[in-house]
């Protein structure tokens, strides 16, 4: 069961896996959640009754019964991992810890104007896990305003001590705030010849890449496939690092694949969720349980529901045996990966889906779309919402996109003359406007947040957030779209679609059925030539056919320009403005969402 509250002055006895240092019990709980085996923890807060060397210790614990005996102890704070919970989990920690020195390898020292600048530096440095900043009140003159970037093998401090006039904090890479490049490519027939920090077994290069991504020290990896000549190294995933942050040597080797940590793009692609099945593959590990199951899908469900299960192997039933049920072997290991992978024994293996909640919901695969045709089908664009105004009468006002369970991203120009958020209604999971009746459920709008530099659509900053009064429960017909990664600024999107209920020609009316059009992106240089009277800035993105014919139009405003990249849909643009609709050599102009990721995160993550 899910227990989120912390138990004050309580210590769990026994079950120790390892001890790390964390600045707070809250962060200890996050570390426990992300650890492959931790189910419970005990944190020791600073206290005069405690030995200072034990302050800030976070003892990660495991238990076959999922609980441990409780003992009263002053300054101890205990709790459970969020593994047992169904809610979305994030490792993002924006907290700044005053008068704490988080120890690690100090590999970079520089002057910074503020702790925020130091944190930004850490976030944009490939090696940095956390930092300590000496404030201008720090006693030692030569250390004032010094920003120390630090890393450790575990990503958590090796020790934490009290130190006046310093502040410490963590890299915000896991908050999607890094400007580091997001390199998704996997390079075939390539070995990166750099130092290995760890090695695990993986069924394919994609899983290896995901493991590298959530390993604190891994910057890139090499994977030896099952056809690799050296049998003992088959399915071996080597996690690597280098001083420069890049591979120093690439060696051409057949049957090996290499790639990079996806740390800078982890909010927009799945890195924890290994959802594939591996046929004719057996995962070896510590056996947790053997249960009968009808199929490998049922076996995966059983593993997902067993909190300690990390991976499984299913052996299909022999004909007419055991009512057609096969054997489902639920397994675990010290690091969450199989200890060995065997092929050719007829098993079907896979991983728990419990970790999927650590990934952004927006990375979930949606149903295959119908190609061709202009009318959408239900569930094809589950992030698309219709924003209605009730003034003078209820009607579709603009489109919008679900980007979080309480947040809609749309265009600022939609709110001209809207005096209050109360008069707005957001409908999600809608295909036809005619579905919306008086009793159709909607989300009320609590707040309209318009970019403070917005003046008019044509001059940019045409972006707004709607904070909903209640949260959206994600389903197949209503779920979020990923924001583009700042590290993806140079990605060339080739599969982009604009959707909306807007006009189909300049003098028309709102369409009943959600319309879709595949539209190519146009370079800003090309777009600028088509709009000589306007300034097309880097904060705008253009899309359209040279000959016209397909475009967004009145009523589509605020809706998404959705682009598919590496099987994940990204909100690349917000429908903003254009000269007429679908005119020859007049592309549509969209708000370039990647340029506003910081603004979006600042507003949506504000306490």
């Amino acid at each position: 069961e899910c227990v989120t509250q912390l138990l004050k002055d309580t210590c769990f006895e026994g079950g120790d896996i390892t001890t790390v240092f964390t600045p707070s019990a809250k962060y200890c709980q996050v570390v426990c959640t992300y650890h492959p085996r931790c189910l419970l923890f005990t944190f020791t807060a600073e206290s005069p009754s405690e030995d200072p060397t034990r302050w800030f210790t976070c003892v990660l614990k495991d238990s076959v019964t999922e609980t441990l005996p409780r003992v009263n102890r002053t300054a101890a704070i205990s709790g459970y991992s969020f593994k047992q919970c169904s809610h979305q989990i994030s490792a993002c920690n924006k907290d700044i810890y005053v008068d704490l020195d988080m120890k690690g390898i100090n590999y970079n020292s520089s002057v910074a104007k503020s702790a925020q600048e130091c944190q930004e530096r850490c976030t944009d440095d490939v090696h940095c896990h956390f930092f300590t900043y000496a404030t201008r009140q720090f006693p030692s003159l030569e250390h004032r305003n010094i920003c120390l970037l630090k890393h450790t093998q575990t990503g958590t401090p090796t020790r934490i001590t009290k130190l006046d006039k310093v502040v410490s904090g963590f890299s915000l890479k896991s908050c999607a705030l890094s400007n580091l490049a997001c390199i998704r490519d996997i390079f075939p027939n390539t070995v990166f010849a750099d130092s290995n920090i760890d090695s695990v077994m993986a069924p394919d290069a994609f899983v290896c890449g995901r493991i590298c991504t959530h390993h604190p020290g891994c910057l890139f990896f090499t994977f030896f496939s099952q056809e690799w000549p050296k049998e003992s190294q088959r399915n071996l995933c080597l996690l690597k690092t280098s001083e420069s942050g890049l591979p120093s040597t690439r060696i051409k080797k057949s049957k090996a694949l290499s790639g990079f940590s996806l740390q800078s793009c982890r909010h927009s692609i799945p890195v924890f969720c290994h959802s594939s099945f591996y046929h004719d593959t057996d995962f070896l590990g510590e056996e947790l349980d053997i249960v009968a199951a009808k199929s490998h899908e049922a076996c995966q469900k059983l593993c997902t529901n067993a909190v300690r299960c990390q991976f499984f192997t299913y052996t299909p039933a022999q004909a007419s045996c055991n009512e057609g049920k096969g054997k489902c072997y639920l397994k675990l290991s010290s690091n969450g990966s199989p200890t060995k992978i065997l092929h050719g024994r007829g098993g079907i293996s896979g991983y728990t889906l419990r970790l999927c909640k650590m990934d952004n919901e927006c990375t979930t695969k949606i149903k295959p779309r119908i190609v061709g045709g202009t009318a959408s089908v239900r569930g094809e664009w589950p992030w698309q919402v219709t924003l209605h105004t009730t003034s003078p009468t209820q009607r579709h006002l603009c489109g919008g996109s679900i980007i979080g369970n309480q947040w809609i991203l749309t265009a600022a120009h939609c709110f001209y003359g809207v005096e209050s958020p109360k008069i707005l209604r957001v409908y999600s999971g809608i295909l036809n406007q005619s579905e919306i009746k008086e009793d159709t459920s909607f989300f009320g709008v609590q707040e309209i947040i318009i970019h403070d530099q917005y003046k008019m659509a044509e001059s940019g900053y045409d972006i707004a957030l709607l904070k909903l009064e209640t949260t959206v429960n994600y389903t197949d017909s209503q779920r979020p779209i990923c924001l583009p990664s700042k590290g993806d600024r140079n990605v060339i999107y080739t599969d982009c679609w604009v959707t909306g209920w807007g006009y189909r020609k300049l003098r028309d009316k709102i369409q009943n059925t959600l319309q879709k059009a595949k539209i190519p992106l146009v370079t800003n240089e090309e777009c600028q030539k088509r709009y000589r009277g306007h300034k097309i800035t880097h904060k705008m993105i253009c899309a359209g056919y040279r000959e016209g014919g397909k475009d967004a139009c009145k009523g589509d405003s605020g809706g998404p320009l959705s682009c598919k990249h590496n099987e994940v849909w990204h909100l690349v643009g917000i429908t903003s403005w254009g000269e007429g609709c679908a005119q020859r050599e007049r592309p549509g102009v969209y708000t370039n969402v990647v340029e506003y990721v910081d603004w979006i995160l600042e507003k949506t993550q504000a306490v």
Partner: antibody
């Protein structure tokens, strides 16, 4: 069922003010715009303005902007219309009407206001 | 302001007749037009909304059509109880405006 009950007839002198009430029941008062419309003897309908009780957002016809104040009391689900500086041409039946999902679907019975010296 | 011009201002027809009342908007109001029936001494009642949607409980002899600037209310077979004044109104933009009304009588 939805009901809009308006206050009784008023006889006023020119220059005076009048405040009419409209008590709503049978629906969530805060979630619908309340409009006010008047009809002079033998004439058509004339829109005065509207109010959204949940936020006190209002819109007025320019003709009435300086003389009309629309308010709403959510605790009693009552909308009010105050018209000041009355003149003889303000003699009319004043209706409150709820803007339903797409149109003015429920109307009060009307309040007759007579302005005469 | 959008001007709604209703015609005729009055008409007389026999029971069973097909009756048509038109309303012309001075600019495009899409389909944001409603029709109301008002009997003497009573408040108006909604008949048609969204130009062509019959309101709950309204007999199916009443129908509406049109979009843009030209709208029509049709009574397919006039009944004695249909004697009333009929108003069209637009709710496309502020200020909301109404036609001057059409008074319908039985011959």
């Amino acid at each position: 069922q939805v009901q809009l009950v308006q206050s009784g007839s008023e006889l006023k002198k020119p220059g005076a003010s009048v405040k009419l009430s409209c008590k709503a029941s049978g629906y969530t008062f805060t979630r619908y715009w309340m409009h006010w419309v008047r009809q002079a003897p033998g004439q058509g309908l004339e829109w005065i303005g509207n109010i959204y009780p949940d936020s006190d957002s209002t819109n007025y016809d320019e003709k009435f902007r300086t003389r009309v104040t629309l308010t709403a009391d959510t605790s009693t689900s009552t909308a009010y219309m105050e018209l000041s500086s009355l003149r003889s041409e303000d003699t009319a039946v004043y209706y409150c009407t709820r803007m339903g999902f797409y149109a003015m679907d429920y109307w009060g019975q009307g309040t007759t206001v007579t302005v005469s010296s | 302001d959008i001007v709604m011009t209703q015609s005729p201002s009055s008409l007389s027809a026999s029971v069973g007749d097909r009756v048509t009342i038109t309303c012309k908007a001075s600019e495009n109001v899409v389909t944001y037009v409603s029709w109301f029936q008002q009997k003497p001494g009573q408040a108006p009642k909604l008949l048609i909304y969204g130009a062509s949607n019959r309101y709950t409980g309204v007999p199916d002899r009443f129908s509406g059509s049109g979009s843009g600037t030209d709208f029509t209310l049709t009574i397919s077979s006039l009944q004695a109880e249909d004697v009333a004044t009929y108003h069209c109104g637009q709710s496309y933009s502020y200020p909301l405006t109404f036609g001057q009304g059409t008074k319908l009588e039985i011959k």
